[in-house]
């Protein structure tokens, strides 16, 4: 539960909670905004980046996001929190404790985005589709 | 029983350095994830800065990367956190806190010390 020493809300800036009224802790998200990559045409891919991060708000999740152009493929991983869009997309998986990279439509380019909440989830990040629950024959797997 | 007790706290000017110490007693230290939080006045918490065990692996918040250092001396049931190029934004109550799973998954059990207030102003 929450200390009684430590301030609850001050300027609505809450102490977040869980269920059980204990204070949440942040996750751990690998954090190294955008780098390029050599990510191309994998299963998965590690994230080759050496800056693992302690989110700022408990709230947040691990997002990958992958780009390819006729100039170059970047791979940036960051915090965001699940609430508020990212690149102008909501973060669907969020709850997921891996990072299924899913293609979103982005004029002249090829855009994948991901997001999970286990600790250094971004890490790796997959490309695969059968690990991809929009697969209706996995959907149909997992509900026999 | 549980006791964790932060001590270092003060003023320093900015640019200036301070060593935070947590002693720990009640429970086996040395197997413990340990954090350092802080709550600057009229703020939430910001969790600045976690160590694991066994291993010691070390975690650090963006705002405080490069600056401060978690460690631990498990002979002497202590955490530690240097901290450097303090800022006056660094000002807050810090406190130290440890984590452990319940054996439920995604649950936890946490332990808070009083806090310590550190200062940056010149």
């Known amino acids: 539960t929450i200390p009684p020493h430590v301030q609850k809300s001050v300027n609505n800036d809450m102490i977040v909670t869980d269920n059980n009224g204990a204070v949440k802790f942040p996750q751990l998200c690998k954090f190294c905004d955008v780098r390029f990559s050599t990510c191309d045409n994998q299963k998965s891919c590690m994230s080759n980046c050496s800056i693992t991060s302690i989110c700022e708000k408990p709230q947040e999740v691990c997002v990958a996001v992958w780009r390819k152009n006729d100039e170059n493929i970047t791979l940036e991983t960051v915090c965001h929190d699940p609430k508020l869009p990212y690149h102008d997309f909501i973060l669907e998986d969020a709850a997921s404790p891996k990072c299924i990279m899913k293609e979103k439509k982005k004029p002249g380019e090829t855009f994948f985005m991901c997001s999970c909440s286990s600790d250094e989830c971004n890490d790796n990040i997959i490309f695969s589709e059968e690990y991809n629950t929009s697969n209706p024959d996995l959907l149909l797997v997992i509900f026999q | 029983e549980v006791q964790l007790l932060e001590s270092g706290g003060g003023l320093v000017q900015p640019g200036g350095s301070l060593r935070l110490s947590c002693a720990a007693s009640?429970?086996?230290?040395?197997?413990?994830q340990m954090w350092w939080v802080r709550q600057a006045p009229g703020k939430g918490l910001e969790f600045i800065s976690r160590i694991d065990s066994p291993g010691g692996r070390t975690y650090y918040a963006n705002s405080v990367r490069g600056r401060f250092t978690i460690s631990r001396d498990n002979s002497k049931n202590t955490l530690y956190l240097q901290m450097n190029s303090l800022r006056a934004e660094d000002t807050a109550v810090y406190y130290c806190?440890?984590?452990?799973?319940?054996?439920?998954?995604?649950?936890?059990?946490?332990?808070w010390g009083q806090g310590t207030l550190v200062t940056v102003s010149s």
């Open positions: 009640g429970f086996t230290f040395g197997t413990e």
């Open positions: 806190a440890k984590r452990r799973p319940t054996g439920v998954s995604g649950t936890f059990y946490d332990y």
